[in-house]
């Protein structure tokens, strides 16, 4: 059978600072468990964006709907764009255990930040 | 709609081992979670087992006497049962695991059960 | 392990009267709660997931509420089939998935 795929359409997005960036990623299984975890950039000095489950991430929102059953669209909303913000960044499925495992990454999504228009 | 058949269950010595099935339908089941949670006589619930695709989760009381597995192909999940002991006699219900935005699970559909005896 | 207590052990309610059963975890679980009900010889029936959002085809008069360690389920008016068993069960941490002890619901 099919295994889990991470799907993040966009290879790139642009945004105006100040605006917000939706970044997109779906995923094609309910399985492995485990949660799904966003990142700005790749190994070891990766920053986490976005943790469901612990952390605070004022300025991250999800787009699909917290009662949602079945859910598979793991995208997210970055409000209040800056030129820091820019970078790449990977929706990654991890593997329930003590501690989680990462399974797999989607192929990242590259955030460009425009100057503000005038 | 979704059905959950259980079946393998039976009066079994201590000791000895029993492998339950569940057979599915009415859904995908090769993207879900599947668990089994038993029900001893006139008690509550408690989990046994979750599965995943390849990735099995259990409860302390049941780890490495029994074993969890699926077959995709055949929309069927089992519960290898070893080294049954009297406080494993219980109904045995087979459950779709079900998520709710980003977080789960719980399970919302349940089969009839199928009833494990231990005794002597 | 997250340890749920449910309150009280047996209910005796008439038709028609108000119901709330309590759900306590052992520590915070957020809003992860799903409630169960039972009725004798039967498997459970999901009723409430997410503490507070009904399943499909729940009728109305169910409803849940609460976050972080208190939970109710309350039925507004009791019908004579929702007599049975009621469970709590958190999926905030696992392994274990663990339910509450349950509360009976008698005919008075």
């Known amino acids: 059978e099919e295994e889990l795929q991470v799907i993040q359409p966009d290879k790139s997005v642009s945004v105006a600072a100040g605006e917000s960036a939706i970044l997109h990623c779906t995923v094609t299984s309910l399985i492995p468990v485990g949660p799904i975890q966003w990142f700005r950039g790749a190994g070891p000095a990766r920053e986490l964006i976005y943790n469901q489950k612990e952390g605070h991430f004022p300025r991250v929102t999800t787009v699909s709907e917290s009662t949602k059953r079945e859910n598979m669209d793991f995208s997210i909303s970055i409000s209040n764009i800056t030129p820091a913000d820019a970078g790449t960044y990977y929706c990654v499925k991890f593997r329930k255990g003590s501690p989680d495992t990462e399974f797999k990454s989607g192929a990242g999504t590259e955030l460009s930040v425009r100057a503000k228009p005038s | 709609d979704v059905q959950l058949v259980e079946s393998g269950g039976g009066v079994v010595r201590p000791g000895e081992s029993l492998r339950l099935s569940c057979a599915a339908s009415g859904f995908s089941f090769s993207i879900y979670a599947m668990s089994w949670v038993r029900q001893a006589p006139g008690e509550g619930l408690e989990w046994v087992s979750t599965i995943g695709a390849d990735d099995t989760y259990y409860a302390d009381s049941v780890k490495g006497r029994f074993t969890i597995s699926r077959d995709n192909s055949k929309n069927t999940l089992y519960l290898q049962m070893n080294s049954l002991r009297a406080e494993d006699t219980a109904v045995y219900y087979c459950?779709?695991?079900?998520?709710?935005?980003?977080?789960?699970?719980?399970?919302?559909?349940w089969g009839l059960g199928t009833l494990v005896t231990v005794s002597s | 392990e997250i340890v749920l207590t449910q309150s009280p052990a047996t209910l005796s309610v008439s038709p028609g009267e108000r119901v709330t059963f309590s759900c306590r975890a052992s520590q915070n679980v957020r809003s992860d709660i799903a409630w169960y009900q039972q009725k004798p010889g039967q498997a459970p029936r999901l009723l409430i997931y997410?503490?507070?959002s009904r399943d499909t085809g729940i009728p109305d008069r169910f409803s849940g509420s609460g976050s972080g360690t208190d939970f109710t389920l309350t039925i507004s008016s009791l019908q004579s089939e929702d007599f049975g068993v009621y469970y709590c069960q958190q999926y905030y941490d696992w392994p274990p998935f663990t339910f509450g002890g349950g509360t009976k619901v008698e005919i008075k």
């Open positions: 459950a779709k695991d079900s998520t709710v935005g980003w977080s789960g699970d719980f399970f919302d559909y």
């Open positions: 997410a503490a507070s």
